[in-house]
């Protein structure tokens, strides 16, 4: 079967995944955006989302996930800090656009986290845990419960990369406090 395009990131425990999702700013600047994990045979699960409406360059932190939406650049920055092996899996950025189904942004991210550091002497490996200090005012947004099954079964575009790394279960520490409320009818 054809797959949606994936980009693979291989990182070590404790490091930071830092990706940027490009969107059409005229259409989606203030739309609510989310970071989701996709498990085989399941609907994507929202792990964190921006506020509604999304605020410009205002960090939203849910556990170890930090979202920043840069309206003037049409860019959603997603960081997962202090990565754990259990974080390995397939992720995607989406834009909520009720009443239509969420709009998926390219590419999906295949995250592979392994144990131990791979640094050279003198490299600042632990900086990923220290560089980004999120202010205490950081908000936790309410994430919609809504996820269309069609986001799993939609006709995929031509894949430019096939990554066959198996999915792993994920258990993101401190993410259980996401409040999920059905904000769409």
């Amino acid at each position: 079967a054809t797959k949606l395009t994936e980009e693979k990131y291989e990182l070590k425990e404790g490091q930071t995944l830092d990706v940027k999702c490009d969107y059409t700013l005229e259409k989606f600047a203030s739309s609510q955006k989310a970071w989701q994990i996709i498990r085989d045979g399941e609907m994507p699960k929202t792990l964190a989302c921006t506020e509604r409406p999304s605020k410009n360059s205002h960090p939203v932190q849910v556990g170890r996930i930090i979202l920043e939406d840069y309206h003037d650049h049409g860019l959603l920055r997603v960081r997962m800090v202090n990565l754990q092996v259990e974080d390995s899996g397939l992720y995607q950025c989406v834009i909520y656009q009720p009443p239509k189904e969420p709009h998926m942004l390219f590419d999906r991210i295949r995250l592979v986290v392994t144990k131990g550091f791979s640094g050279t002497p003198g490299s600042n490996e632990n900086s990923t845990q220290n560089v980004y200090k999120i202010p205490p005012t950081t908000t936790k947004a309410l994430c919609p419960l809504y996820t269309s099954p069609r986001t799993v079964t939609q006709a995929p575009p031509k894949s430019t990369a096939d990554v066959s790394t198996p999915d792993s279960e994920i258990n993101l520490t401190n993410v259980t406090d996401i409040i999920r409320v059905p904000v769409f009818n």
């Epitope: 490009d22 049409g74 390219f106 590419d107």
Partner: antibody, heavy 119, light 108 residues
Amino acid sequence: EVQLLESGGGLVQPGGSLRLSCAASGFTFNAYAMSWVRQAPGKGLEWVSTISGSGSTTYYADSVKGRFTISRDNSKNTLDLQMNSLRAEDTAVYYCAKVAGSNFFFDHWGQGTLVTVSS
Amino acid sequence: EIVMTQSPATLSVSPGERATLSCRASQSINANLAWYQQKPGQAPRLLIYGAYTRATGIPDRFSGSGSGTEFTLTISSLQSEDFAVYYCQEFILFPPHTFGQGTKVEIK
């Protein structure tokens, strides 16, 4: 297979104009940002300009700002670079590059087209 | 603007030996670094991105490491086709995204 094919290079006098084009195939063109990167003879790589997948956001190096314009036609899968007020220091091989879907690095490159600015 | 500095400018290595190339950023870029290889008369080719991840089709003798401001590209056992110029590039957030000046790996 991703393919990027540049055209439009050539010899132009200082102060003149040139339009470079890049024909893209093998990927969902409108989903990815695209860039131009140049390399002066015997020198290193220099980023020139980037345009988002939708074309709504553009970025330019200070050295070309106000003189170069990047654009794209997603219906034709083409990327353009309009170069005006050309200077001798703009002489370089210009590469069309596909930006990765997750970050601003370049995962595929064209073979380049040579622009020579000389009187 | 972030300045990327590569060292050494030229590295003379015998085939089969290990090559270690360095790249330093003027400020922390986390792991937002890519490495490219360029052979004479050819376009650059992506080797490593995110400081550690090998691009599709890149042999495992190429490996990247480092984070923050100090990065390393290691070629564990140089093959004849590896003699080329190598560039690092940062992509921390928005353009401009700067390249290092390059390291030429030549046959000793």
